[in-house]
């Protein structure tokens, strides 16, 4: 399907919203330390480009690549080698090179100022006064933050946020109507994010293969009714669309997963009965619904695997004429099966199949060897049944704060090199599995469990590839995509880690900690915890809960005091020598 | 090694009640499927209802509305609550209880429903 001009037919496939709308996500996502105004000016002139090739697609460069009229674009910009340092040097290279040289630049970690809400009513104005430029800025600053945001994804989330203040900005109380839908578009993204990490990750570092096995196993899951053949053609058509987005290619993504809502919507009876009220919405709710879809019902009388996986007497001879096609069948027929389980749980046990047949295959006897295969997995099935047990005791015990903590202890203890607030970051995340997934019913608990733990452990290997200072961090980030949470569980106190030395500093505090949010409050203490940890990794549960309680106490008594400052600078050095004094 | 008891059957009248019961001892892990069958004289075996793992249920169109599966979980439990029977209800009925690994049958229990 050529065409004389990418950028013409992109254009027209798009229309000239979305168009704009993805490029400037795309250039956000590459130069994430470029004013706004910049950019807006250089989506201004790809986009006349456009035009001009959608007018003639035979007028000069329209018949570049999207890549090589993305990059010249990139590469004007003046400031580049002062902003971006050696990024600079992408631009001496040719397509393909100098694209995935921008690729490896991008910052998952960008040194960016937090977003502030202003006011309600300074934003209310802002969107009349130029609702066009309000919902740029919003693109751009989302974009350049999540380097790997799910572009499609984030233009309906700008359609979301369009909608939040169209709404609430004509309400009796602007706030109470804005503040929540905010706070939701907020935590959404940032989950959306993450979860598109993880599919970006699995792409680059292990492979389409990975990502392929991972999506066979949870389509599969979500549409039981469907053939083997039906979810390999989604399977295929869902790894293009990835490998597109993740590799900086969102014009070309967009086009496919608009092709693949609309393929899913004319097939549904092939597919599954619970597509049919995402089909009747616009195309990005339509995309966004089908994506998030709940899972279709089980079929009645779905036979045991046994006779076509273990009984056969063609077992070997089927793996060995199309390892993948019989693996993939395999998967599929036990994932529809278990909605109950975690995706990566399906996938260590088709792992875990695979490596019976390839010793069983070349033994004298395969039948009597490989006769036990579903014996052995029993263990790894329930190992996180036991572990999301075990955790969502202890989350219902404590509460979400108090686990969290409990996290930030054992995460410490395992990997003391990681930095503290990284160590916060994802102990906090991992934190919220309970209040997402232990009220869930028993069936729906470990895939909620363990595939958001995936997800939050992929943002430690992301972070920590960054910088990285922990050998068994990169360990278990880099032996196997699937083992990833088994090996970060299996970990236990590192003894080679040398105690940080004591820091008054670190647990100096001053009055400004009685005006932060509960949030913010919470970020601190668990901060002093994490550093607690380092400077004594073998102190016991009872001395850090001691410690922490003392200090609940001193700052609650700090901020109730008339002179707050005066009370934390006399009331510091106390807290800090009894901490010394209690962890001794 | 894995047995499946089950218990509950009997002689009713028309328009009476029975509630089946069938128990798994030995060790059965990931269950995705629990279902009761019945099996008339000189007929096939039927499926009567079922229970998935996602608790999706399944009736056989003679059955909907009068029968009722259930199951515990925590106990390798499953039941078959059966109301306004009927003559053509009379079988032995079967549980059935599956993981990937195999497909575990009771001896069956013999309902009838006779005035």
């Known amino acids: 399907d050529t065409h004389k001009s990418e950028v013409a037919h992109r254009f027209k496939d798009l229309g000239e919203e979305h168009f704009k709308g993805l490029v400037l996500v795309a250039f956000s996502q590459y130069l994430q330390q470029c004013p706004f105004e910049e950019h807006v000016k250089l989506v201004n002139e790809v986009t006349e480009f456009a035009k001009t090739c959608v007018a003639d697609e035979s007028a000069e460069n329209c018949d570049k690549s999207l890549h090589t009229l993305f990059g010249d674009k990139l590469c004007t910009v003046a400031t580049l080698r002062e902003t971006y340092g050696e990024m600079a040097d992408c631009c001496a290279k040719q397509e393909p090179e100098r694209n995935e040289c921008f690729l490896q630049h991008k910052d998952d970690n960008p040194n960016l100022p937090p977003l502030v809400r202003p006011e309600v009513d300074v934003m209310c104005t802002a969107f009349h006064d130029n609702e066009a430029t309000f919902l740029k800025k919003y693109l751009y600053e989302v974009a350049r933050r999540h380097p790997y945001f799910y572009a499609p994804e984030l233009l309906f989330f700008a359609a979301r946020y369009k909608a939040a203040f169209a709404e609430c900005c004509q309400a009796a109380d602007k706030a109470a109507c804005l503040l929540p839908k905010l706070d939701e578009l907020r935590d959404e993204g940032k989950a959306s994010s993450a979860k598109q990490r993880l599919k970006c990750a699995s792409l680059q570092k292990f492979g389409d293969r990975a990502f392929k096995a991972w999506a066979v196993a949870r389509l599969s899951q979500k549409f039981p009714k469907a053939e083997f053949a039906e979810v390999s053609k989604l399977v295929t058509d869902l790894t293009k669309v990835h490998t597109e987005c993740c590799h900086g290619d969102l014009l070309e993504c967009a086009d496919d997963r608009a092709d693949l809502a609309k393929y899913m919507c004319e097939n549904q009876d092939s597919i599954s009965s619970k597509l049919k009220e995402c089909c009747d919405k616009p195309l990005l709710e339509k995309s966004h619904c089908l994506a998030e879809v709940e899972n279709d019902e089980m079929p009645a009388d779905l036979p045991s695997l046994a006779a076509d996986y273990v009984e056969s007497k063609d077992v070997c001879k089927n793996y060995a004429e199309a390892k993948d096609v019989f693996l993939g069948m395999f998967l599929y027929e036990y994932a529809r099966r278990h909605p109950d389980y975690s995706v990566m749980l399906l996938l260590r046990l088709a792992k875990a199949y695979e490596a019976t047949l390839e010793k069983c295959c070349a033994a004298a006897d395969p039948h009597e060897c490989y006769a036990k295969v579903f014996d052995e997995f029993q263990p790894l099935v329930e190992e996180p049944q036991n572990l999301v047990k075990q955790n969502c005791e202890l989350f219902e015990q404590l509460g979400e704060y108090k686990f969290q903590n409990a996290l930030l202890v054992r995460y410490t203890k395992k990997v003391p090199q990681v930095s503290t607030p990284t160590l916060v970051e994802v102990s906090r995340n991992l934190g919220k599995v309970g209040a997402k997934c232990c009220k869930l019913p028993e069936a729906k608990r470990m895939p909620c469990a363990e595939d958001y733990l995936s997800v939050v452990l992929n943002r430690l290997c992301v972070l920590h590839e960054k910088t990285p200072v922990s050998e068994k961090v990169t360990k278990c980030c880099t032996e196997s995509l699937v083992n990833r949470r088994p090996c970060f569980s299996a970990l236990e106190l590192d003894e080679a880690y040398v105690p940080k030395a004591f820091n008054a500093e670190t647990f100096t505090f001053h009055a400004d900690m009685c005006t932060l949010s509960e949030k913010e409050k919470q970020v601190k203490k668990q901060t002093a915890l994490v550093e607690l940890v380092k400077h004594k990794p073998k102190a016991t549960k009872e001395q850090l809960k001691g410690v922490m309680d003392n200090f609940a106490a001193f700052v609650e008594k700090c901020c109730k005091a008339d002179d707050k400052e005066a009370c934390f600078a006399e009331e510091g050095p106390k807290f800090v020598a009894a901490s010394q004094a209690a962890l001794a | 090694q894995v047995q499946l008891v089950e218990s509950g059957g009997g002689l009713v009248q028309p328009g009476g009640s029975l509630r089946l019961s069938c128990s798994a001892s030995g060790s059965i892990w990931g269950i995705y499927h629990m279902g009761w069958y019945r099996q008339a004289p000189g007929k096939q075996r039927e499926l009567v209802a079922s229970?998935?793992?996602?608790?999706?249920?399944h009736y056989a169109d003679t059955v909907k509305g009068r029968f009722t599966i259930s199951r515990d979980n925590s106990k390798n439990m499953v039941y078959l609550q059966m109301n306004s029977l009927r003559a053509e209800d009379t079988a032995v009925y079967y549980c059935?209880?599956?993981?990937?690994?195999?497909?575990?049958w009771g001896q069956g229990t013999q309902v009838t429903v006779s005035s």
């Open positions: 059935d209880i599956r993981n990937v690994g195999g497909d575990y």
């Open positions: 229970i998935t793992v996602d608790g999706s249920t």
